[in-house]
Interface confidence: low
């Protein structure tokens, strides 16, 4: 009778193991051992009993101890079973970035491992199984489908290899994917909200406004602003599932015409964007030309207006006639034409709205001095001792310099309060002098005594 | 708006367990996760660890592993956080949080619930 | 566990200055997917922490463009260009690229 020892083993993959072979015959004619693997005799003293080292065992084997005795040839099988855990546990690469409501499909490849029976294959999220399946296969494959969630942004998921010999009385080998990291995100269908300026004249600054609400995680959201080729620089601000883009944007002469203003929200790996236009325009004021700006009393004055070839313009609220650039008026110039303000209102129409520019010039007639009546008054009669004030005012531009003199020395005090005295009796000769020349006036001044009863 | 309201102060023995709440208001309490943070003297600001409000799955920071337990009730729109065998250590002010589940920030807190553990 | 470093640990300021606040990590912040995931919160006194700016710079709603932040990988800094009285407490600088999420020790602003 043959026996071995042990029966069963399970080692590592590579590893040696110490078979021995046994008869139950005193002298038996032979004893040994039939396997494929390298194996050592050890000498043992007897001849009923031999161990062998087999190493480097790479697969399950099944060496068979044998012995010839006197009553006939028997033989022991011994079973060895490799064990070794996966050489590659991976998940299928997928985007990282998932929308919400999708379903997502995990993959996970198994290579290598032994014993299969006792080899499993397990998906999780984060710490929690979400599927376990023995491997089977090679490369063994198990897949699940999960459905993207808000809260599943950062999370990992991973798979994992249980090689359990615990029954074999060894320990559970656990093998682990490189996690997989899920961002999730809700990128709603509707586009992108743009306000801007439908015009915007050539070397002025306008305002634009994108904003878009319902996104998950509005964190993560790149907003790209631009107006045709020129890429705008916006301040973003974001509210809990929202965000306001608001940028300023310059154009010059070159940009004139029209323009695509785009606004692109790109998040995970879709993206909405809206377009709008945006006509860029020159517009300069009307110009009003006055033939000259000072001008004296009694000159033929001609006021032009001119504007934008395509602009209609009034002067002085009276259209061109015909409707057009250009307007103009003739007038011969009076005192009360000085200071007179000539106003020259242009409208364009771009892109169906009417934009309004206006200027203002001013006339000024030169004219003068003058003294009259009204102003300067020939004849005053104040009681004596009495407080009264010389009026006298001269007319004119430039402003005349005026002096009232009584005998060429005696001045008059045009304006100041005074106490009427005798000495302030007589006639005064009023001068009122400019750069447009110089005219005179009489002035009298009666003092009329208390009488005494 | 939206609202984290935590269950009030607490005076306990020490080796007890209590369990604190938190309930979300003011949006889809299932979009979100709750994560809980622990405000001490010694060690400020430390995280306990997050909990879906929709699957129930967890994190926890390894130190409070045994510790602490996170649960969820749906129905109620409602956290809970568990802390078991306590000690003086474990006096402090409990904040519940809005969040995502690790990489986000926490967006809105509740309002603190005070823990004293004490003979 | 990644360490957060803050300082100043007070910060006294006079209203109308502009204040510094600084936080460093034990371990780069730059996820795989290239954001740093560093996040700033302010608590005021009795009060529960309230979130200022996440991701680096990026002002949550209703945070005044007085607070900006910025920094990459380990050095990230929260400025306030001209402080107010209602910018008092305790700023938090706290990491979400590593697990377990952890905060800065807290830095006090104060007149």
């Known amino acids: 009778q043959t026996s071995v020892s042990p029966s069963k083993v399970i080692l590592p993959r590579g590893g040696s193991v110490l078979v021995t072979c046994s008869t139950s015959c005193d002298q038996p004619k032979l004893l040994g051992i039939e396997t494929p693997l390298p194996k050592k005799e050890l000498l043992l003293p007897g001849n009923n009993r031999k161990v062998y080292e087999l190493s480097n065992v790479q697969e399950d084997s099944q060496p068979m101890c044998y012995s010839n005795c006197p009553d006939g040839q028997s033989t022991a099988k011994t079973f060895l079973t490799v064990y070794w855990t996966p050489e590659r546990v991976e998940l299928a690469p997928l985007p990282s970035w998932q929308p919400v409501g999708k379903n997502l499909t995990l993959r996970c490849q198994v290579e290598g491992g032994a014993p299969r029976a006792n080899l499993t294959v397990v998906l999780l999220r984060g710490e929690k199984e979400l599927k376990r399946e023995p491997a089977v296969g090679e490369p063994a494959e198990v897949t699940t489908t999960v459905l993207v969630r808000r809260d599943h942004h950062g999370a990992n998921f991973s798979c994992r290899t249980e090689l359990d010999l615990r029954p074999q009385g060894l320990e559970l080998f656990e093998n682990t994917s490189a996690p997989y990291q899920l961002q999730t995100f809700v990128l709603p269908a509707t586009p992108p909200q743009l306000v801007s300026p439908r015009v915007l004249e050539v070397d002025t600054q306008g305002t634009v406004v994108c904003s878009l609400d319902g996104l998950f995680p509005v964190s993560e959201a790149q907003v790209h602003l631009a107006l045709g080729d020129q890429r705008l620089n916006p301040t973003v601000t974001y509210g809990n599932d929202s965000f306001s883009a608001k940028a300023s944007v310059s154009v010059t002469a070159e940009d004139e015409g029209t323009q695509r203003l785009t606004c692109a929200v790109i998040l995970g790996n879709q993206s909405q964007e809206t377009l709008q236009t945006v006509t860029i325009y020159s517009f300069p004021a009307p110009n009003v030309i006055l033939t000259k700006p000072e001008v004296s009393e009694g000159t033929e004055v001609t006021v032009k207006c001119e504007a934008h070839p395509r602009a209609k313009v009034t002067l002085n609220g009276v259209p061109a006639q015909p409707l057009g650039p250009r307007a103009q008026l003739l007038l011969k110039a009076t005192p009360e034409d000085n200071g007179r303000s000539f106003s020259c209102s242009a409208t364009l129409e771009v892109a169906g709205q009417l934009i309004h520019k206006n200027q203002t010039r001013e006339l000024r007639v030169l004219y003068g001095p003058r003294l009259d009546e009204r102003d300067c008054p020939g004849n005053w009669t104040w009681p004596e001792n009495s407080q009264q004030t010389p009026m006298c005012q001269a007319w004119g531009n430039p402003l005349p310099e005026l002096k009232c003199l009584k005998d060429g020395t005696f001045p008059l005090p045009i304006g100041e309060s005074v106490t009427v005295t005798r000495d302030l009796e007589g006639t005064y000769l009023c001068r009122a002098r400019s750069t447009q020349g110089e005219v005179t006036r009489k002035v009298t001044v009666n003092v009329l005594s208390p009488r005494y009863e | 708006q939206v609202q984290l309201q935590q269950s009030g102060p607490e005076l306990v023995r020490p080796g007890v367990s209590v369990k604190i709440s938190c309930k979300g208001s003011?949006?889809?309490?299932?979009?979100?996760?709750i994560h809980w943070v622990k405000e001490s003297h010694a060690k400020s600001l430390e995280w306990i660890g997050v909990?879906?409000?929709?699957?129930?799955?967890?994190n926890y920071n390894q130190k409070f592993k045994g510790k602490a337990t996170m649960t969820v009730d749906k129905s109620s729109n409602t956290a809970y956080l568990e802390l078991a065998r306590l000690t003086s250590e474990d006096s402090a002010i409990y904040y519940c949080?809005?969040?995502?589940?690790?990489?986000?920030?926490?967006?809105?807190w509740g309002q603190g619930t005070t823990l004293t553990v004490s003979s | 566990d990644v360490v957060m470093t803050q300082s100043p640990l007070s910060l006294p300021v006079s209203l109308g200055d502009q204040a510094s606040i600084s936080c460093r990590s034990s371990?780069?912040?730059?996820?795989?997917?290239?954001?740093?995931?560093l996040h700033w919160y302010l608590q005021k006194s009795g009060q529960a922490p309230k979130l200022l700016i996440y991701?680096?710079?990026n002002r949550f709603s209703g945070v005044p463009d007085r607070f900006s932040g910025s920094g990459s990988g380990t050095d990230f800094t929260l400025k306030i260009s001209r402080v107010e009285a209602e910018d008092l407490g305790v700023y938090f600088c706290?990491?979400?690229?590593?697990?377990?999420?952890?905060f800065g020790g807290g830095t006090k602003l104060e007149i």
């Open positions: 909990i879906s409000a929709y699957s129930g799955d967890t």
């Open positions: 706290s990491q979400s690229t590593h697990v377990p999420l952890t």
């Open positions: 371990q780069s912040l730059v996820h795989s997917n290239g954001n740093n995931y």
């Open positions: 991701k680096v710079s």
């Open positions: 003011g949006y889809t309490f299932i979009d979100y996760a």
């Open positions: 949080a809005r969040g995502g589940w690790l990489l986000l920030s926490f967006d809105y």
